[in-house]
Amino acid sequence: FGISGRHSITVTTVASAGNIGEDGILSCTFEPDIKLSDIVIQWLKEGVLGLVHEFKEGKDELSEQDEMFRGRTAVFADQVIVGNASLRLKNVQLTDAGTYKCYIITSKGKGNANLEYKTGAFSMPEVNVDYNASSETLRCEAPRWFPQPTVVWASQVDQGANFSEVSNTSFELNSENVTMKVVSVLYNVTINNTYSCMIENDIAKATGDIKVTESEIKRRSHLQLLNSKA
């Protein structure tokens, strides 16, 4: 339908990151319309000839969808009426990284917003005591990272200490030949201390903590996406 002369509507996106091989979400919201049949959602990717996804008249319209997105996209159809145009992207690929545009047309007007989408691999590290080692040793493992991250050890007792001389990090390519397993070993650890293994690339930062006392071992890990407002 024609929208000439109608005003602009507000469209909001959030920069995000996708984990290769998993499903991702490209977030987009807009001023809702009272009639679903009056809402058109079009997702574009910079440099791509076809559409990433189109939703109009209450259903997907995929006749102009680009080959690289075929069978991998969906909107949350039941949430479109309340202004959610977010796109679910299945089986995220490294090549999905780039600038996306969420284009919205409603009876009120049209609007668009860009979204930077990064892709890579990131996973939680797990820190364990390596009982096989000759000295007290910690082993930090994370199954999937890409691009290659940096690994830094820290300790609560020796804050600011540089552990690079007493640690060894290796990266092992996984079977799909893109992501890598990260293994870092810290030597000469002392009891009654908390150690942190921090893994970071330009997409995510993950930390695995281990507290070793004479009576118990406590573990904690968390992961944070970088450059994302989410």
Partner: antibody, heavy 118, light 107 residues
Framework: EVQLLESGGGLVQPGGSLRLSCAAS????????MHWVRQAPGKGLEWVSG????????YYADSVKGRFTISRDNSKNTLYLQMNSLRAEDTAVYYC???????????WGQGTLVNVSS | DIQMTQSPSSLSASVGDRVTITCRAS??????LAWYQQKPGKAPKLLIY???TLQSGVPSRFSGSGSGTDFTLTISSLQPEDFATYYC?????????FGQGTKVEIK
């Protein structure tokens, strides 16, 4: 800085062949669809051909279908246009251009002149 | 194929004038229309895509409007550097056809 540099133009006889190249730099070449657009002397712009980032999809104007072949080598950041069975009406400046959003084109190369004449 | 028809084919205007160029598509192209500026001996330059979205770095005196089959490029106050030929292009389906161009000349 994004740059596109065409080469391979020149004088060719009717019925002859020519291969144009477009060297790209300053961006992730494999992520962008690419196009060839031509402009005959003193005339307007004519879209000739396009190719997806992966090279898996190609598109042609009816006037060149079956005679021209677009291709790309993402490892060399280069776009090609193989032109066979050339005709006098193929005489033009040939520009390569990058897909921006859908088929809007930005930037463009400086162009290379193809002259089909006996 | 989608035919694109521009009008006028040429126009004369003075610095400071408001200039309007129209482009008509032979079928509905939603808002998938781009506008380009070309100066003699130079490659075209993208001004507007998606019918009304200004390309980065393009002065705000350029604006685009329309959807469906009828589109307009407006230069609100013509500057000396705006004397050039302007082309519309439909970007919705192959072949991605151009209009025949509109030459903006100095009066």
């Amino acid at each position: 800085e994004v740059q596109l540099l065409e080469s391979g133009g020149g004088l060719v006889q009717p019925g002859g062949s020519l291969r144009l190249s477009c060297a790209a730099s300053g961006f992730t070449f494999s992520s962008y669809g690419m196009h060839w657009v031509r402009q005959a002397p003193g005339k307007g712009l004519e879209w000739v051909s396009g190719i997806s980032g992966s090279g898996g999809s190609t598109y042609y104007a009816d006037s060149v279908k079956g005679r021209f072949t677009i291709s790309r080598d993402n490892s060399k950041n280069t776009l090609y246009l193989q032109m066979n069975s050339l005709r006098a009406e193929d005489t033009a400046v040939y520009y390569c251009a990058r897909t921006q959003w859908r088929a809007s084109l930005d930037p463009w190369g400086q162009g290379t002149l193809v002259n089909v004449s006996s | 194929d989608i035919q694109m028809t521009q009008s006028p084919s040429s126009l004369s205007a003075s610095v400071g004038d408001r200039v309007t160029i129209t482009c008509r598509a032979s079928q509905d192209i939603s808002y998938w229309l781009a506008w380009y500026q070309q100066k003699p001996g130079k490659a075209p330059k993208l001004l507007i895509y998606g019918a009304s979205t200004l390309q980065s770095g393009v002065p705000s005196r350029f604006s685009g409007s329309g959807s469906g089959t009828d589109f307009t490029l407006t230069i609100s106050s013509l500057q000396p550097e705006d004397f050039a030929t302007y082309y519309c292009q439909q970007t919705t389906m192959s072949p991605y056809t151009f209009g025949q161009g509109t030459k903006v000349e100095i009066k």
